[in-house]
Interface confidence: medium
């Protein structure tokens, strides 16, 4: 920030300069000297604080204009200002020289000074409220006494009639879209009119240009009008100086998130810019900078209480959607339910979108992030869930094409753990990828450096692409520990499937029968026995065990997980013809957590003594620990189309209470 | 850092003349006035004269006119008092002192004792 | 000339008291005054000029007031290490002159 500036004094002559609170005019008295003269003393008014400066040492002047100094290249003037100026060029520095022991000045020369206050203010200290020229304004640091201004990308819609999102345009529309941006004041103090020659300028970068707007609020009292001023094609704007004591109150937004090649950093500035003549330009004789970090997109992990559960009405799911119903009401939040008419015969919703949201200390509000994949739901985001204070963003690859793993059933995201000392307050995104090496598929480049680019949730690449689908959600989920702050990561293991059905082989109950009263499926008599002798299952399994095992390392290193932090829970895959697995029957993992309430897929197992095994030994693994078990029937619905309860519901979640900006990423 | 080196003591008959050196570091030596003040022992201090370090122009207490010298040589950064006809009312230390507010001595040399007697 | 007259050739204190050294012009000297400090076989060391502006690195318990004739040095919370004479200075008119200085001893 321009804080120094020289004045060129002249002997014989005023000079006039406009001087700003807070930073230092210097001006070289030696140069300026009369022929002839050996000395200088100074003079000046009150509120004007004047230093000699020789060889970096300062000398404060206090005087009557009675001591000397002698004239030398290396002596200058540093002048500083206690108070904004009444009257324009009211204050002054008066320079007398003499010959060696004249007590009559040979000439002098005059600094005319008019002194006023210019402060470009935001909420650096982050309360919530702007306060004034807090002097960390113009830089942004993280922790919990970190300081710099937050901004939110107006992603969301006030006005419903509009098609997109308010940061679109530039327009405003109404006071509530207000709310969602970040104030800026601008305040100046002076006599009532500047000295001709002076004009006071807001402007930002051209690469912030896109990222930023602000607004103005004309007329505050009657019929108010919301002008847009800086932001895309605008790149500066001039403020007219009232005089006196002023407060000019801006609107600030964000239009884009962090991404690849964007900080999410972005400065606006304020100068005072001196006319020297016609043709000439203008130049700055002071800048006040601030700057903004634009909240990141944060994702809600399973252990965060759920708000809204989304499901999809299908021609086929009557019973499915009867038993989401059931379980939701046990718990106090809210089903949604997508109906056909929007669905258009797309059931998998937690593939098409994913909630998180968006914070700043005067604000927050929930944001979807909608996927590339752009299945049937597509219109179900913006249509049903980008209103008033809840936002929507997406990214869709330019060039890259759209696989099975842009679905967000391939984006989950950890609680909050530590790692090696490191902590991840928000938790860490997780995504599914191909094998190293492998050259197989991968979530699309946009989405991966889009989440990377949020800085909050550092992701964690896992490897999903030995499934069919190839989604994270089939193989790992977390549940909370009721009562405590404590998560388990639950695993599908197929080692642990064999394991129980060995043991019930042992129990004598090896012809115990799986998928009971499913017409077909149990017509074919799938028995432990069966399973356990069909060699090319058991070599397929341990097979995907050795994938499972592989992302069960990679979730201990980068989550800074134990064993003891792991539950595995019974699954079994199939290989289909491209070697990839699918779930044998319905694969338990891929679960919905509502607090301590979970949904488990029902996964039709052996049943011994009227029981289902697989039921029995989840209950027995999870309820000890306070967690509820509902096993939901989605074997026709959802499990025969390759995916299960979680595949097919979503879970808008509470923010973190953790502020994000306390953290160091 | 800004330092101020005088010579060393000096013992000198009644009549003759001595001339004490002054080497300035530091700073930058013709921006400030070259000030002399003379302490008898045990007394007070008594300001002998000043010189402007860029001409050699100075400036003298009437007291010491024809008594003091002061010179300077730019190049080396010193500055010089010459006392002349010395008496033993000339026994003394003498202090240079760099004129920061003018004549407020900001920076004294660790000076020089000069002691007539036959 | 003009006359600076310190009344006071000592003055006993104890560590931790506020003493006032006091300097009087025989004529209106506005408040072009400094004050120094002179310890047993040292050069002085300026701690005040323009009546009552420090200089830098001189501890803040040394204060200077006082304008036209009249002057004072304060100094609050006496330290072991100011035992010294202090000399005032007039630098309003030639000849420049000196106080004819105040001991300070500690009790």
């Known amino acids: 920030m321009l804080r120094e500036r020289t004045v060129r004094l002249q002997y014989g002559s005023r000079v006039e300069a406009v001087y700003v609170l807070g930073t230092y005019l210097w001006t070289d008295v030696y140069s300026a000297a009369p022929a002839g003269a050996q000395t200088f003393s100074l003079k000046h008014s009150e509120h004007v604080w004047v230093e000699v400066v020789r060889d970096g040492e300062a000398e404060e002047v206090a005087t009557n204009g009675k001591q000397r100094w002698l004239l030398s290249p290396s002596t200058t003037l540093r002048v500083t200002m206690s108070q904004a100026s009444t009257e324009a060029s009211s204050d002054k520095v008066t320079v007398n020289y003499y010959d060696e022991e004249g007590s009559i000045p040979i000439d002098q020369a005059g600094l005319f000074l008019t002194a006023i206050e210019i402060s470009l203010d935001v909420d650096a200290d982050r309360d919530g409220v702007v306060e004034k020229n807090n002097p960390k304004k113009a830089s942004w640091t993280w922790g919990p006494e970190g300081q710099g201004a937050i901004l939110l990308v107006n992603c969301d819609r006030e006005t419903p009639w509009l098609p997109k999102e308010d940061c679109r345009d530039e327009k405003v529309y109404s006071k509530e879209d207000l709310k969602d941006m970040s104030q800026m004041i601008l305040r100046t103090k002076g006599p009532d009119r500047l000295p001709a020659g002076y004009e006071i300028v807001l402007y930002i970068s051209m690469s912030d240009s896109d990222k930023v707007g602000v607004f103005y609020v004309e007329n505050p009292f009657f019929g108010q009008r919301y002008i847009h001023i800086l932001g895309r094609r605008k790149l500066y704007h001039v403020v007219k100086y009232t005089g006196g004591s002023a407060e000019l109150l801006f609107f600030v937004e964000g239009l884009c998130f962090p991404d690849e090649g964007f900080s999410g950093l972005v400065s606006i500035h304020v100068s005072l810019l001196e006319y020297m003549a016609q043709d000439i330009p203008l130049t700055p004789i002071f800048t006040d900078t601030v700057i903004f970090r634009i909240a990141p997109w944060i994702m809600t992990p399973n252990i965060l209480p759920p708000v809204s559960v989304f499901v999809c009405c299908m021609k086929d799911n009557y019973l499915f959607l009867k038993e989401v119903k059931n379980l939701v009401e046990k718990t106090n939040c809210e089903l949604k339910v997508c109906f056909q008419y929007l669905n258009r015969g797309d059931r998998w919703i937690q593939d098409e979108i994913e909630f998180g949201y968006i914070e700043a200390p005067h604000k927050g509000f929930p944001v979807v992030l909608d996927s590339p994949r752009d299945g049937n739901l597509k219109d179900f985001p913006v249509k049903e869930l980008l209103g008033p204070d809840f936002g929507y963003v997406t990214r869709e690859p330019l060039f890259e094409s759209v696989t099975s793993l842009d679905s967000f059933g391939n984006l989950e995201v950890s609680p909050p753990v530590t790692v090696n000392g490191k902590t991840y307050p928000l938790g860490r995104i997780l995504i599914g990828s191909s094998f190293p090496l492998s050259g197989g598929r991968r979530m699309t480049k946009v989405v991966r450096d889009f989440l990377k680019a949020q800085q909050v949730q550092a992701p964690v690449e896992l490897y999903s692409d030995w499934l069919t689908v190839g989604h994270v959600d089939e193989f790992m989920s977390f549940v909370p520990i009721p009562g405590t702050k404590k998560f388990l990561l639950l695993m599908a293991s197929t080692s642990a499937c064999y394991k129980l059905f060995r043991e019930k082989q042992k129990d004598g109950h090896g012809e115990a029968i799986m998928f009971k009263g499913l017409g077909g499926m149990s017509s074919k008599r799938i028995t432990i026995n069966k399973i356990l002798s069909n060699e090319s299952l058991v070599q397929e399994n341990l097979y995907f065990q050795r994938c499972l095992d592989w992302n069960r390392d990679i979730l201990k290193k980068e989550l800074g997980l134990t064993e003891q932090d792991i539950i595995d829970l019974p699954a079994l895959f199939k290989m289909d013809e491209d070697h990839r697995a699918r779930a044998f029957f319905p694969n338990m993992v891929n679960m919905i957590v509502l607090d301590k309430d979970l949904g488990i897929p029902k996964p039709f197992g052996p049943q011994v003594e009227e029981e289902c095994c697989l039921e029995m030994h989840v209950r027995g693994l999870l309820e000890p620990l306070g967690l509820e078990c509902t096993f939901i029937d989605d074997i026709s619905a959802y499990h025969k189309f390759l995916g299960e309860v979680h595949c097919g519901t979503n879970v808008r979640r509470k923010p973190f209470t953790f502020k994000w900006w306390h953290m160091v990423p | 850092e800004v330092q101020l080196q005088q010579s060393g003591p000096d013992l000198v008959k009644p009549g003759a003349s001595v001339k004490i050196s002054c080497k300035a570091s530091g700073y930058s030596f013709t921006a400030y006035y070259m000030h002399w003040v003379k302490q008898s022992h045990g007394e007070s201090l008594e300001w002998i004269g000043r010189v402007n370090p860029n001409n050699g122009g100075s400036s003298y207490n009437q007291k010491f006119k024809g008594k003091a010298i002061l010179t300077v040589h730019k190049s080396s950064n010193t500055a010089y008092m010459e006392l002349r006809s010395l008496t033993s009312e000339d026994s003394a230390v003498y202090f240079c002192?760099?004129?920061?507010?003018?004549?407020?001595?900001?920076?004294w040399g660790q000076g020089t004792s000069v002691t007539v007697s036959s | 000339d003009i006359v600076m007259t310190q009344s006071q050739k000592f003055m006993s204190t104890s560590v931790g008291d506020r003493v006032s050294v006091t300097c009087k012009a025989s004529?209106?000297?506005?408040?072009?005054v400094a004050w120094y400090q002179q310890k047993p076989g040292q050069s002085p060391k300026a701690l005040i000029y323009?009546?009552?502006y420090r200089y830098s690195g001189v501890p803040d318990r040394f204060t200077g007031s006082g304008s036209g004739t009249d002057f004072t040095l304060t100094v609050t919370n006496v330290q072991s290490e100011d035992l010294a004479e202090y000399f005032c200075?007039?630098?309003?008119?030639?000849?420049?002159?000196f106080g004819s200085g105040t001991k300070l001893e500690i009790k």
């Open positions: 002192a760099r004129g920061d507010y003018l004549p407020s001595l900001g920076y």
């Open positions: 004529q209106n000297v506005d408040t072009t």
């Open positions: 200075q007039q630098y309003d008119s030639y000849p420049f002159t």
């Open positions: 323009s009546a009552s």
